[in-house]
């Protein structure tokens, strides 16, 4: 029979591969059927009988066509600093990712093995590089003429306001305070109302996190603990 119409199990022609969704069984020396995702090989094929497949039991899975004797165990439940983004089913493993405000310090094949809180930049320091799903926030000291008065994982250094007459000069952790008889300017909600400066600074939007890539399909080696960067709080 031509290979296209042979039924499994069959002996392949010398130099030929098995066909779609088949594997070569070394013991039987035959091409045999694989089991579909969500199943495993309950009984391996012989020269006269094909693979017998069975469904994966609860909390186990196979994601690929296979001839494994047992399904894989789903990963343990997600920890409190994680969210379950994919449930454990017969065809897929559970995937845990870090909840907002955390990043993945140690990836696994899919999802995250270990989450860590995003670094917070203390007053006098602003966010130089935002955190992503897989990288921590990087803080930098506020340059002359800029300040940050918050402890935050998102706030950047903002320019001091420019005054006609300076009451209190700004520094890295505080805005300048102006002296003026002009009416007070309207501020952003929650901001302290200060006397009107000569020119109001433009609103500075927070940097948006750069898009992060999907978790690596290779296992990452765990790295030793690193000290917090300057200007961060070990929160």
């Amino acid at each position: 029979l031509p290979a296209q119409v042979a039924f499994t199990p069959y002996a392949p022609e010398p130099g030929s591969t098995c066909r779609l969704r088949e594997y070569y069984d070394q013991t039987a020396q035959m091409c045999c059927s694989k089991c579909s995702p969500g199943q495993h090989a309950k009984v391996f094929c012989t020269k006269t009988s094909d693979t017998v497949c069975d469904s994966c039991e609860d909390s186990t899975y196979t994601q690929l066509w296979n001839w494994v004797p047992e399904c894989l165990s789903c990963g343990s439940r997600c920890s409190s600093d994680q969210v379950e983004t994919q449930a454990c089913t017969r065809e897929q493993n559970r995937i845990c990712t870090c909840r907002p405000g955390w990043y993945c310090a140690l990836s696994k094949q899919e999802g995250c093995r270990l989450c860590a809180p995003l670094r917070k930049c203390r007053p006098g320091f602003g966010v130089a590089r935002p955190g992503t799903e897989t990288s921590d926030v990087v803080c930098k000291p506020c340059a002359p003429g800029t300040f940050s008065n918050t402890t935050s994982s998102t706030d950047i250094c903002r320019p001091h306001q420019i005054c006609n007459v300076v009451a209190i000069p700004g520094n890295a952790s505080m805005d300048a305070v102006c002296t003026s008889t002009s009416p007070t300017r309207s501020m952003a909600p929650g901001a302290v109302h200060l006397p009107q400066p000569v020119s109001t600074r433009s609103q500075h939007t927070q940097p948006t996190p750069e898009p992060s890539t999907a978790p690596s399909t290779s296992f990452l080696l765990p790295m030793g603990p690193s000290p917090p960067a300057e200007g961060s709080t070990g929160d």
Epitope: A3, Q4, P12, G15, S16, T17, L20, R21, L64
Partner: antibody, heavy 119, light 107 residues
Framework: QVQLVQSGAEVKKPGASVKVSCKAS????????INWVRQATGQGLEWIGW????????QFNENFQGRVTMTRNTSISTAYMELSSLRSEDTAVYYC????????????WGQGTTVTVSS | DIQMTQSPSSLSASVGDRVTITCRAS??????LNWYQQKPGKAPKLLIY???KLHSGVPSRFSGSGSGTDFTLTISSLQPEDFATYYC?????????FGGGTKLEIK
């Protein structure tokens, strides 16, 4: 990144043979089938066959059986497709493509090699 | 061999349109239906496999549906880069076979 790079264009006379190469990079060459697919000018796509680089075993479309030879050199991650007894209707662009044998798709393609058969 | 028939063979549409291309197999192919996009002078690119699974990097405006013998590729809102020729391909039985293609042109 994962890519397949093919050899350059060929012009052959009827009855001759042509051998096209396909160099893989960015993945483990021996773990995926390399398929060959051709496309005549302005026409659709036609599957020729595949080679499994790990052992060199092949699977062919019966329309090409006896005229096509597929080989590989694992040390340089390169697959070859040789088509013999060429005729004018073999004039086409020949593509190599990485294949998935469970779902029968081609996820990475070479840039194509134009083979012209003309007397 | 399994014959794959695409319709229409050509189609004119505008940016923003919703477009549907159909593919019919001469016999049951379960869900083993793949879709490709090809631009002139370029190799085909895999869009969708196993009827509806989106290949990595493919925009979510592409979707696939159907089962058995009748399948559809839908582009929810056409973008300028979507004007190309689309091919279906069955992955159920050897030999692997392709549809004749649907050329999507700008109206």
């Amino acid at each position: 990144q994962v890519q397949l790079v093919q050899s350059g264009a060929e012009v052959k006379k009827p009855g001759a043979s042509v051998k096209v190469s396909c160099k893989a990079s960015g993945y483990t060459f021996i773990t995926y089938d390399i398929n060959w697919v051709r496309q005549a000018t302005g026409q659709g796509l036609e599957w020729i066959g595949w080679i499994y680089p790990r052992d060199g075993n092949t699977q062919f479309n019966e329309n090409f059986q006896g005229r096509v030879t597929m080989t590989r050199n694992t040390s340089i991650s390169t697959a070859y497709m040789e088509l013999s007894s060429l005729r004018s209707e073999d004039t086409a662009v020949y593509y190599c493509a990485r294949g998935d044998r469970d779902y029968g798709y081609f996820d990475v393609w070479g840039q194509g090699t134009t083979v012209t058969v003309s007397s | 061999d399994i014959q794959m028939t695409q319709s229409p063979s050509s189609l004119s549409a505008s940016v923003g349109d919703r477009v549907t291309i159909t593919c019919r197999a001469s016999q049951d192919i379960s869900n083993y239906l793949n879709w490709y996009q090809q631009k002139p002078g370029k190799a085909p690119k895999l869009l969708i496999y196993f009827k509806s699974k989106l290949h990595s990097g493919v925009p979510s405006r592409f979707s696939g549906s159907g089962s058995g013998t009748d399948f559809t590729l839908t582009i929810s809102s056409l973008q300028p880069e979507d004007f190309a020729t689309y091919y279906c391909q069955q992955g159920n039985t050897l030999p692997l076979t392709f549809g004749g293609g649907t050329k999507l042109e700008i109206k």
